[in-house]
Structures are given as structure tokens and as C-alpha cells.
């Protein structure tokens, strides 16, 4: 009863496409609407102003790529109002393969302001002709046996790639730099032992900056056998931090791997000194090995990727790492900390990427351990922060395909430069129910602590009711299931729980209320469940049918967001997505009436 | 029994108050100042207050069955039941199921043609004769058809590089065809040579990820009865695969966000619109298969048996068999699964409004009884041995006249149930004798109903 159905306003820009309304996000005094494309049409973002009643397409200045996936992923940071929009459809060919990852855009406060752009989980293409230079450390800190292991590693790589389109060169660096053999030498004599036979350990400093510039300008030269059409790759092998400074702008077109080995890289700070030499993301291009022994295991990661089609991979091998990650298929932001889902990572076992503030680097977090049964689980299909007043928050991530049953993993964010840790697993109970396909954290009493985790299973199949929302409450040892919500009977395929969102307090009792969308209950419906101390009311206070709002509507309730007063009338408004439209519903004013009765005679 | 009443001023309102409520139609039953609602109470209470038994109105729910002896082999009886339902009081009737011998069978073989099924395809090509022979051991009228599937032809389900769309198989495997979602190859036929010939022309294909688009294909097989050639007989759908399946929600990875509409979209025997619609959900498919009386047999490799067993919990009339790595045991598997399916009988009804509740008591031939279940269920049902289900139907309020059907899942016979309200009180005084009401009204179940402008117990 708290939302006024009669005064609903509909926004539907011309030519917006049927998926306008797939995502809705209240920002400032307007609503951002995602409109992924269909067929060959690209996706768009629209900004709808409540005052004017119009929606205008958002221009992503500086972005030269848009796929039909744009509009699928929108998130806002409740702490500072910044907006993250991702397009998980950045596809490109690499040899005979097609890679698929995401493009993300971060806006501070509004879509007109400055925009940061990043490519989370971007996999570089190493294809066709590859010219590879080994740049190896010859400083005095290397013991003779360690230096020999570096030489053995290089020989191993060259031998294994001898009948391919790879060409090699090698440069030793210390205080100065020496080309041990160039590409022409390699072409003349493809014998790694002979090519590295006369290497003399330099035993001086570690001038890494200068060495990289030397390779970029003095080794990748056509007259020395470098091929103009080849992909340039540089593998830097070092055991210590640089003893010089400067920049490596000359090497920006070279794919740069850096391998840091040994005791000098035990701290996070020392490891991070290597990041500036490597391509991004560091998670892929910086390799830290504690012993020189481990060099020989590294080769598999540097080999050319050939897609293994279904049916030809060995059970224990991962065919796909990040090539088809679909990074950015989900996203969430809290306190300036952005994460995006990457369902396709590690053979679709999935995971998520922890993005650095400038979006230029990321760290992948996935299933640990990576066993065969987690494959095709789609972890990262949903991600949602569960903020806490204490220092570290939890992140919930859904894997709705896990074993075809679905599960949700809870992770604790790193403390003081540590690592992410998986702290809880919650399993779905019905095959195909898409348990974890929607997640929502609720801070019922608005004290800064997330008390409830709502897990949607929109494809749950019941005799009369389709879809469920499972309510988990934070307890001492984690989140525990306390109850479940379901829609009205008569809709076995209604997809109750496809959208779940915490609203502002719309009934005036000081507690947060929750809206749940069921877009396939006839033309769609939205349920309101009021907050109550320690949880949610099990019965909806209101069920709004799409047809009550607008005749001919479809998929009403596919997305919902209601955290702001868009009208400036002091009443909270709720944005609801439907097929090719977005509806704004206003809440009704709440009046407290106090009745005093007296009887005479008493 | 009890009678909880609220603001009752007529016999009908009394009857609607609950199954324990009865109405006293005796004249002058109420004393001065008594409200009419005291006429509404439990039978013992009314008798105690001096209401004669034949003055107590207590309409009861009842069932009238009628047989329809037209047509041949009927496995369900009766064919028609009429129920008169008083709110809150169940009407019960019995349904008998007698499994017939040699019931006709249509079997559609739906096969995963992703690359890992290469050796399976080679064996299935040789199956036609064996498959039809196996069916003819069970029935005088068996037919077989064939279809195949791979997956949606968008990233990341298949490699969309042009060369790989032409030939998705590794090492430029020559006996390879472009990927496709579902291809209907052979309409149901009793010609085993035709099966051999047409299936013989199939080539393997390939995709990227492990799960396949089998649910897309199953939906089309269920949604396209004319194209597939289903008759109104036992419909078996053999689903052969060595891996899992995509379902609703997965399409998002390929920017396919439109829910599956459950309709037939075959053009030139291909599901060409698979890239427009998401995969069906498991529930949606279960719904569609039941609606079309199709019983799936999941022929899957050992690694996948547990997964597909969970699927059979959602799809009521379905079975799982373990497929050898090269599908060489598939005929044996189908025979076993058919025996399992045909010896288990589920009695169920179509969707009902909230106002009607149906429960089943199953009295199975092996002495097992299940009571108050949402559907009837007997296992180990033998040919020509009748089993009985007691069906109880309750209305929660005075309903509109309507009907629903009960059927044995996987069979074509139905019981039509017509439902009528039993809410009226047939009181003997419903004449238009106005004298008892001072000529200013008429008597209805012991109460004067006054003309406008008059009130009082006798419209005085």
C-alpha cells in the first residue's frame, strides 16, 4: 500500500529497444537506464530526468567501442554516488580464436563528469608471428646455480617452441646491457645451447629501466631480424629491485612479462615494485616465484593459447583462462572499491576481479581449489558487497550454474595488503533454480552493518509459485538461512526473485524495506516486503501488477532501484524496469494517527 | 466440528462460513432481540436449541460420476465427473487406471552432436533397425524420429571466428559441420531404412564450453508437434548427451536476454531463432513436456547420471539411463527406461485457481498407499492390473462453475471434472407466501426479507 500505482510515470524513449529497462539505477535526481541491444544493435545507457520526463542517451566520451552488452551492468556506490557501468561484450579475434571480456566506465557523481575507463581481465593476444626477447638479470646477487637456472629456463622455452612462428633474442642486463643473440642469430642457428654457450655473468647492478629501453630501441629492429608484423613480447627475469630509475615509454607496444624470483620479493611492497615494468593487469603479467626451481613450471602459461573445443581437453587441464571471461557481467561498488564478475574465467568456473581505483589493473579471485566440479559454475554472475562497520566487508558472489544447482560464496576483502579469503559457501537445493542469480544485502536498521543477505533463485519451480528468495541472517559464525519469500500462487514460471533490492524506508517505521520483482507473473509484478526488527515481514505489504501501472506492459519488475526522492517532495521514489520502459512509482505519505477515546459515564 | 461465523444474515452466508455451519430454517426460532445469526451454528448446537432435524439446512458436497463407453482402449475411468462443492467440504471420487498392453509408441531420438559425441554418432547411425525392433517387442505400432543439437551460435558458447563457424572441430576435422542450435532431421516414421539413411548423413560439430543447448532442442521438440509428427500416443523423447545443459539465465553471457517463449520456431527444420531467445528454464521445460505428454529418457554418460537424476525430480514422468561412452548400449537403455516409465503412474491435474484444492490417495496394486498427496503416484504398475486413486476436491469459497482435467502423465486419456457450487439452501418455505411477513416481505429460510421501507422481524 506504500507505493502509489495511480501516479506512476513511464519513460520509454523512441528506438530504445525492448531491453531498455534491463537495469535501472537512481542517481542524483534522475535514473540511469541500461538498454542492452538485440541482434546487431548495440547497447546504450540512458539518463532519464524525472523533472522533464525525457531520457537521453549517454555519450561515452573517449570510448571507441560499444557492444550490444552495454547496459547490462550498472552499479552505484552508496557512499559517494559514483557510478560503474560495464560492457561485458568486448570481443576481438586472436588467431583463430575470439576473446570476450569487458569494458568498464567509472563516473564520479554523474555521467557528464569525468570518466575513467578500464578493461578488466583483458587477455592480450599473442598470435601468429611472435618476436620474443628474454631480458635476464646478470646482477651480483645471483648465485651461479641460480644464474644457470635462468639460462636453462630460456633454453627450455626455445626448445619447446622451436617449430613455431616464434623468434627469439636474449639480452643480459646488469649495470650495462649485452645482446647475447639477436633475432637474426636465432634464425641462422636455432640451437639454444649454442646461442647461450658464451654467456658471461656480468655480476654488477640491476638497471632494469635502462635495460627495457635498450631492448625496445636496440633489439626490436628489422635489420636485426625483427619482423614488422610480429607480436612483440618481452620476458624480464630478475631477482631484485631496480637500481636505476626513469620510464619505459619506449616499450609501451611490447607485451611485457616480468618474473621476480627469490628472497627479495617476499613482501607485497617489493613485489609491487615490479608492476611498473609489466603490462597490465599485474595478475597476468607479473609472476613471483619463491625459488628458481619453479621457473620450469612457468612455461605452460607462456605457451600459445589454442582454443580447446568441448570434448578435446583433458579433464585436469583448464582450456580457458581469461580469454572468454565475460568480465563485467556483474559489478558492485562500495566505499570506492569496485569488483566485477568474470563468469567465463577458468573454464567458466568463474570468479571476480578486484579493480584498482584507476581501473587500470585488477586481481582475479576465483574458486579455491579449482576442481573439475566447479567448472561451468559461473561464479561472478552476481556480486554484491555486504558492508560492515568493522574494517573489512564481505563480498557475496553467485555461481548459479554450480553443479546445475547453484551456490553463493562469501569472501572477506583483504586486510592491510593481504589476500581475499573465502569464508562461507551457501548451496542451492533445486536443479536449474538459478540460486545466486540475484543477490541483495540489507542493512535493515541502517546502522552500517549488513544484517541480511537475500539470495534469489528466480527459476525455482514450485507447483504454484515460481521463484524464491532465501533470507540469510548474519550470525556469529556467518550467514544462516532463516526463512524464504515467495510470490502469489498461480505463477509457477513467474521468476519471483529476478530482481531484489533494498529500498529506503517507505513505510516510515525507520526500517529498510525490500522490493522483489517477478517479471513473468503475467505481465510482471513487484512485491514490497517491509523491514522489521531482525528481518523482513514474510508477507508482502503490497503486490503491484504491471497492468495496474500501464496496460500492455511486459516484464514489469525485471529490475528495481529505489533509494532516492526524485521529485523533491520528500517521498521516496522507486524505479522499475520493464520491456522497453522504465516506470517511476512514488511512495505515499505516511500519516501517524493517534486516537484518544474517553467514555462518559466512565 | 465448529462453526466460526462472522456477520451472518442468511442461510447462504452461513453455509459459506465453514463446513461445520448449518442453518435452522424453523419459523420463530429466534426470540426477541436475538440476531438472525443464531440460526447459524453446528448441527448439535441447533438440535440442542430445539431446531428439528428436518429444519436444519446442511448442503453437502457430492460427486456424480458418469462413464463414457465411446472409443476404444481407455486406461482411465470414469471419463466424466460432476462435483457439487460446498466451501471447505471435500467431495471425493475414485479414478481407476488399468494399464493397457501394446499401447502405441512414438520415440524421438534427440542427440548431442558436439565434438565429444563423435563415436556415439557412429553407433547411432546403425541403430534404426534395432530401435524399431525393440519398440515392436513392446507395441504393435512404433515409430522413430531423429533430431540433433549443439548450442547457440554466439560467443561464448561457440567460437564465432568465421573459419571456426565453418568448421568448429579441432585439427580441421573433415567430417564436421557448422554449429547449430537444433536440427529436426527425421519426422517420426516406421521406416527403419529411412532412419538409417537420414541419420547416416549427419556430421559432428563443435562448441566451446562443456554445457550444451539441449534444453533449447527439447523445447522445440515439445513445442512443434506437427513438425515432429507426434501422434496422440505414448511419446518418448530420448535425450543423448555426455555433458550438462544450459538453462535460462545462461543466455546473458551471449547478450540473449529475452525469456524463452516456449513456442515453435522451426524454419527449414532448424531452430533459427535460438540466438534471440534465452534457454528455457528447467521448470518451463517440465511444464511444456507435461502439457504435451512427452516422457524424456535421459541417456547420459556415467559422469552425468547424478545431474540428470536431479532433473527427473522436476520432470515427473522421466527416467535416466547410463549411456556407455560410445552409445553402444542405447537400445537396452531405452527398453529399461520405458519399462520403468510405463510401470509408474502419476495422476495429476491442470492448473487450478486458488479457490480449488485437490489431493490424491493412491491405492497401489503392491499394497502401498500414499495419502493426501498433491498428485497420485503408483510404482510397479502391471499390465491389466487396475489401481485406484481417490481424488478429493475442496473449494475454499462459493466457486463459479468451471471444469478441469485429470490425467495420467504420459498417457492421453483424461477425466473431465465439472465443478459446481453447492452454496444454495433449498428451504421449503421459499414460496412467495407474504402473509407471515405482514404482506410486506417474503419468507426465506425462516427469515422475513422485507420490502424496501419496512423492517422488523416480521416486517411489521
Amino acid at each position: 500500500y506504500n507505493l502509489d500505482v495511480r501516479g506512476a510515470r513511464s519513460f520509454s524513449p523512441p528506438r530504445a529497444g525492448r531491453h531498455f529497462g534491463y537495469r535501472v539505477l537512481q542517481v542524483g535526481n534522475g535514473v540511469i537506464v541500461g538498454a542492452p541491444g538485440e541482434g546487431n544493435s548495440t547497447g546504450s545507457l540512458y539518463q532519464c530526468q524525472s523533472g522533464t520526463g525525457h531520457c537521453l542517451p549517454v555519450t561515452l566520451r573517449g570510448s571507441n567501442y560499444t557492444s550490444k552488452y552495454l547496459g547490462m551492468t550498472l552499479a552505484t556506490d552508496p557512499t559517494d554516488g559514483s557510478i560503474l557501468a560495464c560492457d561485458p561484450g568486448l570481443s576481438r579475434t586472436c588467431d583463430q580464436n575470439t576473446y570476450l571480456s569487458g569494458l568498464c566506465y567509472l563516473f564520479r557523481q554523474n555521467l557528464q563528469g569525468p570518466m575513467l575507463q578500464g578493461r578488466p581481465g583483458f587477455q592480450e593476444c599473442i598470435k601468429g608471428n611472435v618476436d620474443l626477447v628474454f631480458l635476464f638479470d646478470g646482477s651480483m646477487s645471483l648465485q651461479p646455480d641460480e644464474f644457470q637456472k635462468i639460462l636453462d629456463f630460456m633454453k627450455d622455452v626455445m626448445k619447446k617452441l622451436s617449430n613455431t612462428s616464434y623468434q627469439f633474442a636474449a639480452v643480459q642486463f646488469s649495470t650495462s646491457y649485452k645482446t647475447e643473440f639477436d633475432f637474426s642469430d636465432y634464425v641462422k642457428r636455432k640451437d639454444p645451447d649454442a646461442l647461450l654457450k658464451h654467456v658471461k655473468h656480468m655480476l654488477l647492478l640491476t638497471n632494469t629501466f635502462g635495460a627495457i629501453n635498450y631492448v625496445a630501441t636496440e633489439v626490436f629492429r628489422e635489420e636485426l631480424g625483427a619482423r614488422p608484423d610480429a607480436t612483440k613480447v618481452l620476458i624480464i627475469i630478475t631477482d631484485g629491485e631496480a637500481t636505476d630509475s626513469g620510464n619505459i615509454d619506449a616499450a609501451k607496444d611490447i607485451i611485457r612479462y616480468i618474473i621476480g624470483i627469490g628472497k627479495h620479493f617476499q613482501t607485497k611492497e617489493s613485489q609491487e615494485t615490479l608492476h611498473k615494468f609489466a603490462s597490465k593487469p599485474a595478475s597476468e603479467f607479473v609472476k613471483i616465484l619463491d625459488t628458481f626451481e619453479k621457473l620450469k613450471d612457468l612455461f605452460t602459461e607462456l605457451q600459445k593459447k589454442i582454443y580447446v573445443i568441448e570434448g578435446t581437453s583433458k579433464q585436469d587441464l583448464t582450456s580457458f583462462n581469461m580469454e572468454l571471461s565475460s568480465s563485467g557481467i556483474s559489478a558492485d561498488l562500495s566505499r570506492g572499491h569496485a569488483v566485477v564478475g568474470a563468469v567465463g574465467a577458468k573454464d567458466w568456473a568463474g570468479g571476480f576481479l578486484d579493480l584498482k581505483a584507476d581501473l587500470q589493473d585488477d586481481t582475479f579471485i576465483g574458486n579455491e581449489p579449482l576442481t573439475p566440479e566447479v567448472r561451468a559454475g559461473y561464479l561472478g554472475y552476481t556480486v554484491t558487497w555486504l558492508p560492515s562497520r568493522q574494517k573489512t566487508s564481505l563480498l557475496a558472489s553467485g555461481a548459479p550454474r554450480y553443479q546445475h544447482m547453484g551456490r553463493v560464496l562469501l569472501f572477506q576483502e583483504p586486510q592491510g595488503g593481504g589476500h581475499w579469503s573465502q569464508v562461507q559457501t551457501i548451496h542451492g537445493t533445486q536443479i536449474g533454480s538459478y540460486f545466486g542469480g540475484e543477490l541483495c544485502g540489507v542493512d535493515v536498521d541502517q546502522d552500517g552493518e549488513t544484517e541480511l543477505l537475500l539470495i534469489g533463485a528466480p527459476l525455482f519451480y514450485g507447483e504454484q509459485r515460481g521463484g524464491r528468495v532465501f533470507i540469510y541472517q548474519r550470525r556469529q559464525l556467518g550467514f544462516e538461512e532463516v526463512s524464504e519469500l515467495q510470490g502469489d500462487p498461480g505463477y509457477p514460471l513467474g521468476r519471483f526473485g529476478e530482481a531484489i533490492t533494498a529500498l529506503t524506508d517507505i513505510n516510515g517505521d525507520g526500517l529498510v524495506d525490500v522490493a522483489v520483482g517477478a517479471p513473468l507473473e503475467e505481465q510482471g509484478a513487484v512485491y514490497i516486503f517491509n523491514g522489521r526488527h531482525g528481518g523482513l515481514s514474510p508477507q508482502p505489504s503490497q503486490r503491484i501488477e504491471g497492468t495496474q501501472v500501464l496496460s500492455g506492459i511486459q516484464w514489469f519488475g525485471r529490475s528495481i532501484h529505489g533509494v532516492k526522492d526524485l521529485e523533491g517532495d520528500g517521498l521516496a521514489d522507486v524505479a522499475v524496469g520493464a520491456e522497453s520502459q522504465m516506470i517511476v512509482l512514488s511512495s505515499r505519505p505516511v500519516v501517524d494517527m493517534v486516537t484518544l477515546m474517553s467514555f462518559s459515564p466512565a | 466440528q465448529e462453526c466460526t461465523k462472522f456477520k451472518v444474515s442468511s442461510c447462504r452466508e452461513c453455509i459459506e462460513s465453514g463446513p461445520g455451519c448449518t442453518w435452522c430454517q424453523k419459523l420463530n426460532f429466534t426470540g426477541p432481540g436475538d440476531p438472525d445469526s443464531i440460526r447459524c451454528d453446528t448441527r448439535p448446537q441447533l438440535l440442542m436449541r430445539g431446531c428439528a432435524a428436518d429444519d436444519i439446512m446442511d448442503p453437502t458436497s457430492l460427486a456424480e460420476t458418469q462413464e463414457d463407453h465411446n472409443g476404444g482402449q481407455k486406461q482411465l475411468s470414469p471419463q466424466k465427473v460432476t462435483l457439487y462443492l460446498r466451501p471447505g467440504q471435500a467431495a471425493a471420487f475414485n479414478v481407476t487406471f488399468r494399464r493397457a498392453k501394446g499401447y502405441p509408441i512414438d520415440l524421438y531420438y534427440l542427440m548431442d552432436l558436439s565434438y565429444s559425441m563423435l563415436d556415439d554418432l557412429r553407433n547411432v547411425k546403425k541403430l534404426g533397425g534395432d530401435l524399431l525392433r525393440a519398440l515392436n517387442e513392446i507395441t504393435e505400432s512404433g515409430r522413430i524420429g531423429f533430431g540433433s543439437f549443439v548450442d547457440k551460435t554466439v560467443l561464448p558458447f561457440v567460437n564465432t571466428h568465421p573459419d571456426k563457424l565453418r568448421n568448429p572441430c579441432p585439427n580441421k576435422e573433415k567430417e564436421c559441420q557448422p554449429p547449430f542450435a537444433f536440427r529436426h532431421v527425421l519426422k517420426l516414421t516406421n521406416n527403419s531404412n529411412q532412419f538409417q539413411t537420414e541419420v547416416g548423413k549427419q556430421l559432428i560439430s563443435g562448441n566451446l564450453d562443456a554445457p550444451e543447448g539441449g534444453l533449447d532442442a527439447m523445447m522445440q521438440v515439445a513445442a512443434c508437434p506437427e513438425e515432429i509428427g507426434w501422434r496422440n500416443v505414448t511419446r518418448l523423447l530420448v535425450f543423448a548427451t555426455d555433458d550438462g545443459f544450459h538453462f535460462a539465465g545462461d543466455g546473458k553471457l551471449g547478450a540473449i536476454l529475452t525469456p524463452n517463449d516456449g513456442r515453435c520456431h522451426l524454419e527449414d527444420n532448424l531452430y533459427k531463432r535460438s540466438n534471440e531467445f534465452d534457454y528455457p528454464s528447467v521448470g518451463q521445460l517440465a511444464h511444456k513436456l507435461a502439457e504435451n505428454n512427452i516422457q524424456p529418457i535421459f541417456a547420459v554418460t556415467s559422469r552425468m547420471v547424478k545431474t540428470y537424476e536431479k532433473l527427473t525430480e522436476i520432470i515427473p514422468k522421466s527416467a535416466v539411463g547410463e549411456l556407455s561412452e560410445d552409445s553402444s548400449n542405447v537400445v537396452h537403455l531405452i527398453k529399461n527406461a520405458y519399462n520403468k516409465l510405463s510401470s509408474r503412474v502419476f495422476l495429476d491435474h491442470n492448473a487450478l485457481p486458488d479457490t480449488l484444492k485437490v489431493t490424491y490417495d493412491s491405492f497401489c496394486s503392491n499394497g502401498v498407499t500414499h495419502r493426501n498427496q498433491p498428485r497420485g503416484d503408483c510404482d510397479g504398475v502391471q499390465i491389466n492390473v487396475p489401481i485406484t486413486f481417490q481424488v478429493k476436491v475442496t473449494a475454499t469459497e462459493c466457486i463459479q462453475e468451471q471444469s478441469f482435467v485429470i490425467r495420467a502423465l504420459g498417457f492421453t486419456d483424461i477425466v473431465t471434472v465439472q465443478v459446481l457450487p453447492q452454496c444454495e439452501c433449498r428451504c421449503r418455505d421459499q414460496s412467495r407466501d407474504r402473509s407471515l411477513c405482514h404482506g410486506k416481505g417474503f419468507l426465506e429460510c425462516g427469515i422475513c426479507r422485507c420490502d424496501t421501507g419496512y423492517i422488523g422481524k416480521n416486517c411489521e
Partner: antibody, heavy 120, light 111 residues
Framework: DVKLVESGGDLVKPGGSLKLSCAAS????????MSWVRQAPGKGLELVAA????????SYPDTVKGRFTISRDNSKNTLYLQMNSLRAEDTALYYC?????????????WGQGTLLTVSS | DIVMTQSSNSLAVSLGERATISCRAS??????????MHWYQQKPGQPPKLLIY???NLESGIPDRFSGSGSGTDFTLTISSVEAEDVATYYC?????????FGQGTKLEIK
Amino acid sequence: DVKLVESGGDLVKPGGSLKLSCAASGFTFSDYYMSWVRQAPGKGLELVAAIDNDGGSISYPDTVKGRFTISRDNSKNTLYLQMNSLRAEDTALYYCARQGRLRRDYFDYWGQGTLLTVSS
Amino acid sequence: DIVMTQSSNSLAVSLGERATISCRASESVDSYGNSFMHWYQQKPGQPPKLLIYRASNLESGIPDRFSGSGSGTDFTLTISSVEAEDVATYYCQQSNEDPLTFGQGTKLEIK
């Protein structure tokens, strides 16, 4: 490397019999459909017999049906053609050819052929 | 049986010129999106060699001057620029229906 070597060709009188063999190597013989194709001197190609990978399905054109029998021994990687009631028009170079793993399709590898001459 | 007819028994082309050899089937050889038509080259004293399978797929190791096209009943083998070593007899073959049948062959000669 895939290799097919035919043997057994000879001069035979009309009405006589002969058995041709084909030794296969360099591939998994039991995976493939195999065939015999003949070519009469100065003439075109004619398929005379085909067999599937496990010997369960066999096909002949009407010209040789009832007279020729194709068989295989997968343990020996060998294909055979038993020819009875030979006629002058059966005189030809007989090729053993490999077909696909899934069906009788194209012939991707051929032997060098063995010559059968039927003459009195 | 499906009868395969190659329109010309012989064809003379100058070196470097384009050669086109056609083949017609008495009924369609298309099934399920594939054309089951194949082309072979046979040089004197040698067995036939597969050039093109399923109408347009180039067999590995065959120079890309050879290409195939067509569907249904009409098919063409094209040699974009004839070389001396291409002198041979070319056969088409269908495998859509048993029995598998060959065309009578087209002999390519240099003008």
C-alpha cells in the same frame, strides 16, 4: 603416414574367383569406413563395395551384388574383397580407399591399386 | 541411382588461365546444410587424389588455386591459374545417397 597397399590381383578365367587384400597402416583402421573402387582400362571410377568401421553395414552396386563380398579384419588392419563368378567386364585396376569415420563420404586416401584381368 | 554428368570430357586451357570444370547431378545432393559433392584429380598411372570435399572445402595440402562451388545439382571445380602440373583427369563424386557414384571425368590439357 597413412598407407594402403593392395595385393592379390591376377589373371583369372571367366567364372573364376579371386580374393583381394588391402593392408592399412598409419591410422586407426577400426575407426574408418573402407571401400573398393575400380577403374577399367581407359575408363572412369566405379565404387564396387563399401563397409563400415565394424563390418556391420555393407553396400554394393547392382553390377556386383551377389558376386562380390567385402570384409575386414580390424585386428589385422586388413580389408578384403572376395570376387566370385568373375566376368570379362570386371577387368580393372582395383583400388582400396579410405572413407570417413562417420559415413560413406569422400575417399581421402587411396592405394596404388592391384590389377585384375578376367580373360579366357 | 544418382547419375553424375560432367559436361565436357576434355578441356584445353592456356597456362595461367582459369579453368572451370562443371558437374551436374540427376537429383540434389544437398542434405542438412551440406552438399555431398567431392572432386578428385587423377594423373596417369596414379590413384585419384582428393581435392575438394563437400563442394567447397579444400583438402589439406592442396594448393589454394583449386576451389569448389555450387549446391543442389550444379557444381563447379575452378583452377584460378592453371599450371603445367595440373594436367590430369578430374572426377566429381556424390555421397548423398547409396550407391556412391562418380562422374565420367574431364581431362584437362594445356593449349
